[in-house]
Structure formats: structure tokens, C-alpha cells
């Protein structure tokens, strides 16, 4: 029974589930947005064609004191294989291009929905 107990304990979350949960969180943020998200903070735009999750986290982690995106930051860290800290700069950031956090979240949501439809869960 001790050995069989492992089957009942929750294993790692399947990538498809993790992506769906991230999409749902971004939907919540965009739908519940009343005041400017994160006081209109600007973040680096990123190139979504590769290494997107780490680049997205590297951008959003520089926004502090914004509770609305804290869960998103945590969820993105689950998709990124390395530890990300504030001040990191990815080659996937679009040079000299900053956009509002609200637009970043909205665009990330659009893109993740496409990936989900295409079955790209990682």
C-alpha cells in the first residue's frame, strides 16, 4: 500500500494544463482590469518567436509592487528552465522597445492562445 500510495499523490502538471492555467490567468487580468494595469508601467517588448517564456518573465520581473501580475510571474517561472532575476536582459527583447504592461499581457495572451491551438505546450 505504501508503494501504491504514489499513484494517488499529484504528479507534475502536464504542459497542456500549465499553459491553459496561464492563459486563464491572463484572461482574468485583462477582463478585471479597471485602473491602468501596474500604474501604466512600461516593460521591454519581446520577440515571441523563440525562448518566449524566459524572455517574458525577464520583462515582467522588473515590475515591482504590482500584485495583479504576481501570479503570472510565478507561473512563467515554471516554464523557464533557468532562474530569472530583475535586471536580466535577454537577446529576445526587442531593442529599445518598451510597451505598457497591459499591452504586454494582452499580446502574450493572444500568442499563448495560438500556441495552445497549435498544440505547442512547451
Amino acid at each position: 500500500l505504501t508503494c501504491l500510495g504514489g499513484f494517488a499523490s499529484p504528479g507534475p502538471v502536464p504542459p497542456s494544463t500549465a499553459l491553459r492555467e496561464l492563459i486563464e490567468e491572463l484572461v482574468n487580468i485583462t477582463q478585471n482590469q479597471k485602473a491602468p494595469l501596474c500604474n501604466g508601467s512600461m516593460v521591454w517588448s519581446i520577440n515571441l518567436t523563440a525562448g518566449m517564456y524566459c524572455a517574458a518573465l525577464e520583462s515582467l520581473i522588473n515590475v515591482s509592487g504590482c500584485s495583479a501580475i504576481e501570479k503570472t510571474q510565478r507561473m512563467l517561472s515554471g516554464f523557464c528552465p533557468h532562474k530569472v532575476s530583475a535586471g536580466q536582459f535577454s537577446s529576445l527583447h526587442v531593442r529599445d522597445t518598451k510597451i505598457e504592461v497591459a499591452q504586454f499581457v494582452k499580446d502574450l495572451l493572444l500568442h499563448l492562445k495560438k500556441l495552445f491551438r497549435e498544440g505547442q505546450f512547451n
Epitope: I46, L48, T49, I99, E100, F104, L110, H111
Partner: nanobody
């Protein structure tokens, strides 16, 4: 905010070439399917061409197929339209626009005028 700025239009003789550019800012260009739409004088809007976010899939109206080429550079946030073998009927204002089905993701540029005349 979001901005799409077209350039490269002008006067060209029939059979000539032009390359239109569209510089995007204020949004994550690399995640969007994009396209070109034109409006000839006194006519309605006509879809010309579109390209998926990765740049791997391109689509063209029959009227421009084989003459026009759409492309993008996601590292430069720029969309292009190479127009060859231009005809008088290609005279129009050319607009760069996002090509997304989802509501709320509809962005358009101000347009650039292309005139094909001898």
C-alpha cells in the same frame, strides 16, 4: 500606444517596382499575423496579402499573386511588401494592419499612396 507607420509609397511607372515598409511600435509585433490592404480611388478596401506571426505562411489576392511578396522582420518590428511588375490598377493607398480574428486586436496604419502611371 500602438502605432503602425507605412512608408515607401510614391509614383512609379508601369512595370516598375516599389517596396513598402510598415514599422510597428507599442505592441508585440512578433506575435501577430499581419497583412496589407489597399483602397483604390473611389473604391472599397481590398485585401492584398497576409503573413503569419512566424513568417512561414503567406497568402495573396489573385490580383497580385506572382508579383507581390510579403515578408517580415520580427527583430526589427517591421512588415514589408515588395511590389514588382506594377500596373495602373495597383494605384491605391496601401494600409498595413494586424490580421487577427480575435476582437480587440485590430490595428491599422495611416496608409501610404502608391501611384502607377506613365
Amino acid at each position: 500606444g500602438v502605432q503602425l507607420l507605412e512608408s515607401g509609397g510614391g509614383l512609379v511607372q508601369p512595370g516598375g517596382s516599389l517596396r513598402l515598409s510598415c514599422a510597428a511600435s507599442g505592441f508585440m509585433f512578433s506575435g501577430y499575423d499581419m497583412g496589407w490592404v489597399r483602397q483604390a480611388p473611389g473604391k472599397g478596401l481590398e485585401w492584398v496579402s497576409s503573413i503569419d506571426w512566424k513568417g512561414g505562411k503567406t497568402y495573396y489576392a489573385d490580383s497580385v499573386k506572382g508579383r507581390f511578396t510579403i515578408s517580415r522582420d520580427n527583430s526589427k518590428n517591421t512588415l514589408y511588401l515588395q511590389m514588382n511588375s506594377l500596373r495602373a490598377e495597383d494605384t491605391a493607398v496601401y494600409y498595413c494592419a494586424t490580421a487577427e480574428d480575435e476582437p480587440g486586436y485590430d490595428y491599422w496604419g495611416q496608409g501610404t499612396l502608391v501611384t502607377v502611371s506613365s
